[in-house]
């Protein structure tokens, strides 16, 4: 039950921040004109990864897409790419993960396989959760370098006594929405690594004979994957040979400390 | 069609407050900013300040401390009051209704004369 | 606040001549994002409120005659009048659209010779 609830709640929280994953990317405040301390203007700027925006006071809205990739600076098409990768391996994830959910029966899909692509969807979800982490802390990076240098030569001079007012961006409110969906996929990711643990089922241990070689100790386990021999210097804590018989399901109830070496 | 029509008392005495109420018709409030601007006989035009649809105003910084601007949409109506005039704040007082993009002003009222003297 | 210089103050014309007129910003109006002058230029005919006749330093205003044609980016700009007509002898003003408080040059009066 536990195991079914961290799943879920995994997915749900992934599911979350993959769809703020994708609003940020799509979101035309990545960075904002910085209004302190700077000369009063009808005119507000805004820019995101794709296009940059203008908003009159009037309410007037112009937008602008980049139409080139070339002339774009290294850093944008970074994050660009980081944000996209986050999204594609998130949108794999949810797939994975919507078949590897407890509650949903497909056929006759072994736990194990559940287990397996649980895990799969996780590291998905970590690895899309810490690239949209990455690409917007590239930005905001990106920002911070840029105001700065451009507070240093606030106004630049335009032949004598004309001026010209430097815009300066400062954060936009698309990436503290990258910076949250991204720790969200990040933290669904881990619970979902977490119930993958749960739902592992243990080694299939078969009513089996133990034959006893003169020479070393073989325990030979029919349809299992696993010879144990008496090779190798921690054989003696391997748990080889249950004994008892119990039933499948026993088997997969009571795991035992030895079932996680 | 879109029409601005300022109204004002004509006279006022120094030192006392002008009110001057734009009614506007053709447009919302709502959507679009109202400017005033006055002129003296004779000068130019100088911009007293800005009431936009949202509500965001902004003045003169020389008449800052003078001046209001308020608005009434459901009666469609923009209100400017000015305290402690003086003569030289004689003009001739414009409404006008700012343009959706280029921050320009596309309709203007007829305008109201304002004359301080005792 | 920004200063506004136009200038000639005045201009003695005769019809169908080409008349210019420049308007200097004391910063520039350019804005970087949608790379737009925010200047607007003003037609004032004697005993009428103004008329607006550009915006964006360059959009001419719907109803607006294409001999009238503005120009001019950063902190300066110009009007030109290719052809003058009897009907556009007023005095014309050109505004900083681009920061707080909006402010309006001395004008340009256009007199007939």
């Known amino acids: 039950m536990a195991v079914t609830a961290c799943q879920g709640l995994g997915f749900v929280v992934s599911l979350i921040g993959i769809a703020g994953i994708i609003a940020a990317t799509c979101m035309d405040q990545w960075s904002t004109q910085d209004l302190y301390n700077n000369p009063v203007t009808a005119v507000f700027n805004y820019q995101g990864l794709w296009r940059s925006c203008v908003r009159e006071s009037s309410g007037f809205t112009e937008c602008r897409g980049y139409f080139t990739l070339l002339g774009l600076p290294a850093m944008l098409q970074a994050v660009r790419a980081l944000m996209i990768v986050g999204i594609v391996l998130g949108a794999i994830g949810l797939l994975v993960s919507i078949f590897a959910l407890k509650c949903i029966r497909i056929g006759s899909m072994e736990d194990s396989a559940k287990a397996n692509m649980t895990l799969t969807s996780g590291i998905m979800f970590i690895v899309s959760g810490l690239c949209a982490i990455a690409g917007v802390s590239v930005f905001a990076n990106m920002l911070v370098t840029n105001f700065w240098m451009s507070t240093a030569n606030m106004y630049t001079g335009m032949g004598g006594m004309v001026q010209t007012v430097q815009t300066r961006y400062t954060f936009g409110a698309a990436l503290f929405v990258g910076w949250v969906a991204g720790g969200l996929t990040l933290i669904g990711g881990v619970m979902m690594c977490i119930a993958c643990r749960g739902l592992a089922p243990e080694e299939t241990n078969y009513k089996a004979v133990s034959y006893h070689a003169s020479g070393h100790s073989v325990a030979y386990k029919p349809g299992g994957f696993k010879a144990s021999t008496g090779f190798g210097s921690n054989t003696k804590n391997k748990k080889i040979y249950d004994g008892g018989a119990r039933t499948e399901d026993e088997v997969q109830s009571y795991p035992s400390k030895h079932d996680y070496v | 069609q879109v029409q601005l029509k300022e109204s004002g008392p004509g006279l006022v005495a120094p030192s006392q407050s002008l009110s001057i109420t734009c009614t506007v018709s053709?447009?919302?409030?709502?959507?679009?900013?109202v400017s005033w601007i006055r002129q003296p006989p004779g000068k130019g035009l100088e911009w007293l300040g800005v009431m936009w649809g949202g509500g965001n105003t902004y003045y003169n910084s020389a008449l800052k401390s003078r001046l209001s601007i308020s608005k009434d949409n459901s009666k469609s109506q923009v209100f400017l009051k000015m305290n402690s005039l003086q003569s030289d704040d004689t003009a001739m007082y414009y409404c006008?209704?700012?343009?959706?993009?280029?921050?320009?002003?596309?309709?203007w009222g007829q305008g109201t004369s304002v004359t301080v003297s005792s | 606040d920004i200063q506004m210089t136009q200038s000639p103050s005045s201009l003695t014309v005769t019809a169908g001549e080409k008349v210019t007129m420049s308007c200097k910003s004391s910063?520039?109006?350019?804005?970087?994002?949608?790379?737009?002058?925010?200047l607007t230029w003003y037609q004032q005919i004697p005993g009428q409120p103004p008329k607006l006749l550009i915006y964006w330093a360059s959009t001419r205003e719907s109803g607006v005659p294409n001999r009238f044609t503005g120009s001019g980016s950063g902190a300066e700009f110009t009007l030109t009048i290719s052809s003058v007509q009897t009907e556009d002898l007023a005095v014309y003003y050109c505004?900083?659209?681009?920061?707080?408080?909006?402010?309006f040059g001395a004008g340009t009066k256009l007199e007939l010779k």
């Open positions: 910063q520039s109006l350019l804005n970087s994002g949608n790379q737009r002058n925010y």
């Open positions: 505004q900083n659209s681009y920061f707080y408080p909006f402010t």
């Open positions: 006008a209704k700012q343009r959706y993009g280029g921050n320009a002003m596309d309709y």
């Open positions: 053709g447009f919302s409030l709502t959507d679009y900013g």
